[in-house]
Interface confidence: low
Amino acid sequence: RLSSKSVNAQVTDINSKGLELRKTVTTVETQNLEGLHHDGQFCHKPCPPGERKARDCTVNGDEPDCVPCQEGKEYTDKAHFSSKCRRCRLCDEGHGLEVEINCTRTQNTKCRCKPNFFCNSTVCEHCDPCTKCEHGIIKECTLTSNTKCKEEGSRSN
């Protein structure tokens, strides 16, 4: 199972409370908006999704210089005032995960179970390997349920 430490290592939390759209990896809690206020000064406008502040705002009402996040490595999925992008999620093959949708500058990686793996909780921290049946299959493994096996000595249909 993914530990809090390993999940947090994949995420730079910039954050989100009250902002549009939705985010977060399972173990990351919602915090107050970071980067809105700096040394008593406000940025006039946030950076758009896919970008970050290049420098801190130094004059009240200053407009930030925004630069793109690193494609394939970082993203921000909402307007924000931070000088950091989020790190793209890694789909850990060792935990039975693979990439469904690659990370872009505006959307985090989407993971799914690898073939022959399943997860019967809808918020998955890892996927389990499908059971291999010795005496025949009643029901194939799916993304959300394990294989159902025939018991030894049960008659075939």
Epitope: L2, V7, R22, K23, T24, V25, T26, T30, R89, L97, E100, I101, Q107, K110, C111, R112, C113, C119, N120, S121, T122, V123, C124, E125, C127, L143, T144
Partner: antibody, heavy 122, light 107 residues
Framework: QVQLQQWGAGLLKPSETLSLICAVY????????WTWIRQPPGKGLEWIGE???????NYSPSLKSRVTISVDTSKNHISLNLTSVTAADTALYYC????????????????WGQGTTVTVSS | DIQMTQSPSSLSASVGDRVTITCRAS??????LAWYQQKPEKAPKSLIY???SLQSGVPSRFSGSGSGTDFTLTISSLQPEDFATYYC?????????FGQGTKLEIK
């Protein structure tokens, strides 16, 4: 602005098949699960099942033998078929979108269709 | 299936009151609970996800808490538009299931 528009037959006889379609206008189609929910008159909400753009489905076990949810990505349509209907299937049927990915806890049926009233009566 | 039980089933309150609705799961669902508001003849509206995260555009007088089996929805100061029926929903495991609803009425 995302909108969900539903249509389908509103009056059915017992043993017939309920068929509803939900059209998605605007927004992303591929990054959501598309869900069907029903609400019998004067009662609570019942989750029927969901589908994503790849055709991966999850169904309520109590309806699984009778229900099929399918997707037409060329039209951004989601359809619901429920066979062998009885009076107990009389309800307001909603389609809705929900975002949930492996490793994420963010979820909410945040956009809903207008609902379709289905009555089963002989 | 996981059973979701809401209490109370109905509740009378006045504008300005603080109101708490509880939802109990028949087995642990971690934090994977959502709250919805439904007004007569309208589709439900998502208020809270992941037990305590506010959906975009929802007023801050709504808050959620809890984990495991016991959850609460609190409205800190009731407004006239808050009189409605509220539902909880678990999404820890399939099938997703809803509570039976709590009807919040004007006293």
């Amino acid at each position: 602005q995302v909108q969900l528009q539903q249509w389908g037959a509103g009056l059915l006889k017992p043993s017939e098949t309920l068929s509803l379609i939900c059209a998605v206008y605007g927004g992303s189609f591929s990054t959501y699960y598309w869900t069907w929910i029903r609400q019998p008159p004067g009662k609570g909400l019942e989750w029927i099942g969901e589908i994503n753009h790849r055709g991966t489905t999850n169904y309520s076990p109590s309806l699984k033998s009778r229900v099929t949810i399918s997707v037409d990505t060329s039209k951004n349509h989601i359809s619901l078929n429920l066979t062998s209907v009885t009076a107990a299937d009389t309800a307001l049927y909603y389609c809705a979108r929900g975002l949930l990915w492996i490793g994420e806890g963010d979820y909410g049926l945040d956009v809903w269709g207008q609902g379709t009233t289905v009555t089963v009566s002989s | 299936d996981i059973q979701m039980t809401q209490s109370p089933s109905s509740l009378s309150a006045s504008v300005g009151d603080r109101v708490t609705i509880t939802c109990r799961a028949s087995q642990g669902i971690r934090r994977w609970l959502a709250w919805y508001q439904q007004k007569p003849e309208k589709a439900p509206k998502s208020l809270i996800y992941a037990a305590s995260s506010l959906q975009s555009g929802v007023p801050s007088r709504f808050s959620g808490s809890g984990s495991g089996t016991d959850f609460t929805l609190t409205i800190s100061s009731l407004q006239p538009e808050d009189f409605a029926t509220y539902y909880c929903q678990q999404y820890n495991s399939y099938p997703y299931t809803f509570g039976q609803g709590t009807k919040l009425e004007i006293k």
